[in-house]
Amino acid sequence: FERTRSLQDPCSNCPAGTFCDNNRNQICSPCPPNSFSSAGGQRTCDICRQCKGVFRTRKECSSTSNAECDCTPGFHCLGAGCSMCEQDCKQGQELTKKGCKDCCFGTFNDQKRGICRPWTNCSLDGKSVLVNGTKERDVVCGPSPADLSPGASSVTPPAPAREPGHSPQ
């Protein structure tokens, strides 16, 4: 089949990094600068992506592969192939349409990207709060008070005055 195909279509012999040039009797011509072909048999070369401005070049474009970009410090990649760069926020914040905003009480974000997530509700697992949550950190759940038989652990259960998961601001 391959031999038949190449007899019928001279372009199928053009390797990656070249294109089948209709203007020159369908001979294989190298991709011009700033372009590439990642597969054989192509009739045109694709334009190389330019990693400019907020984008930085992670891998240069070659005649057979497109450039790959990442983001300048203070920004992180979003989308397939780092199609966009989104602003970093501090831990304890999330990015909104109005910019970086602190996590609401009862939520946290331990990364420079993404959204604030609710603190774990320890009581749902029958556990108690060992370490209170903050804007930057989730609560740490510990054994339930019932599991703490006298002398079985050195952990002091938290004062029961507060609702699980809450911490003073």
Epitope: N34, G53, V54, F55
Partner: antibody, heavy 118, light 110 residues
Framework: QVQLQESGPGLVKPSETLSLTCTVS????????WSWIRQPPGKGLEWIGY???????NYNPSLKSRVTISVDTSKNQFSLKLSSVTAADTAVYYC????????????WGQGTTVTVSS | QSVLTQPPSASGTPGQRVTISCSGS????????VNWYQQFPGTAPKLLIY???QRPSGVPDRFSGSKSGTSASLAISGLQSEDEADYYC???????????FGGGTKLTVL
């Protein structure tokens, strides 16, 4: 189809601040660079600066000390402020959408004329 | 003084082929792609050629672009009276981390 519309005062006094807004309609502001370009009467095009939708900015070094470009994604707008203006800042001001992967200005506003005069 | 250098004027008769040159340096044309814009009097510029030789939809194939080294050129074949306009080359400049323009070429159809 994405359209851009510049708005702001057509007359600014010397030493004051020129303020223009570009409203993006028919598409999202996300994923692109947004530039301000100006053209003095009878002259060529001059890039003022750009802002990426997520806030990254860069300005023409010759204007950098006087320029601020900001973006409001919730309103689909971006803005230009040029301080301490002189008669040399009299020009038609264009806002543009710039493709972020191949960098070309594929959408232009109609332009707004700003005259600096007392 | 523009970063990219274009001839201030060019002319041709209907049906002729004219070319407009654009010269730069290693930090702009030499390492990046070139775009061309067409501007009629009193109107905003319009993208004519991008990435050296690509035409946006709606642009006639009479317009073509090319690049070699630190220079680029715009060719218009089968010149028509409606092609009379100003033409600007532009491209990214790595030292500026932003775009630069040529001074523009006024094309007259005689």
């Amino acid at each position: 189809q994405v359209q851009l519309q510049e708005s702001g005062p057509g007359l600014v006094k010397p030493s004051e601040t020129l303020s223009l807004t570009c409203t993006v309609s028919g598409g999202s502001i996300s994923g692109y660079y947004w530039s301000w370009i100006r053209q003095p009467p009878g002259k060529g095009l001059e890039w003022i600066g750009y802002i990426y939708y997520s806030g990254f900015t860069n300005y023409n070094p010759s204007l950098k000390s006087r320029v601020t470009i900001s973006v409001d994604t919730s309103k689909n707008q971006f803005s230009l402020k040029l301080s301490s203006v002189t008669a040399a800042d009299t020009a038609v001001y264009y806002c543009t959408r710039d493709h972020s992967h191949y960098y070309y200005m594929d959408v232009w506003g109609q332009g707004t004329t700003v005259t600096v005069s007392s | 003084q523009s970063v990219l250098t274009q001839p201030p004027s060019a002319s041709g008769t209907p049906g002729q082929r004219v070319t407009i040159s654009c010269s730069g340096s290693s930090s702009n044309i030499g390492s990046n792609t070139v775009n061309w814009y067409q501007q009629f009097p009193g109107t905003a510029p319009k993208l004519l050629i991008y990435s050296n030789n690509q035409r946006p939809s709606g642009v006639p194939d009479r317009f073509s672009g090319s690049k070699s080294g630190t220079s680029a050129s715009l060719a218009i074949s089968g010149l028509q009276s409606e092609d009379e306009a100003d033409y600007y080359c532009a491209g990214w400049d790595d030292s500026l981390n932003g775009p630069v323009f040529g001074g523009g070429t006024k094309l007259t159809v005689l």
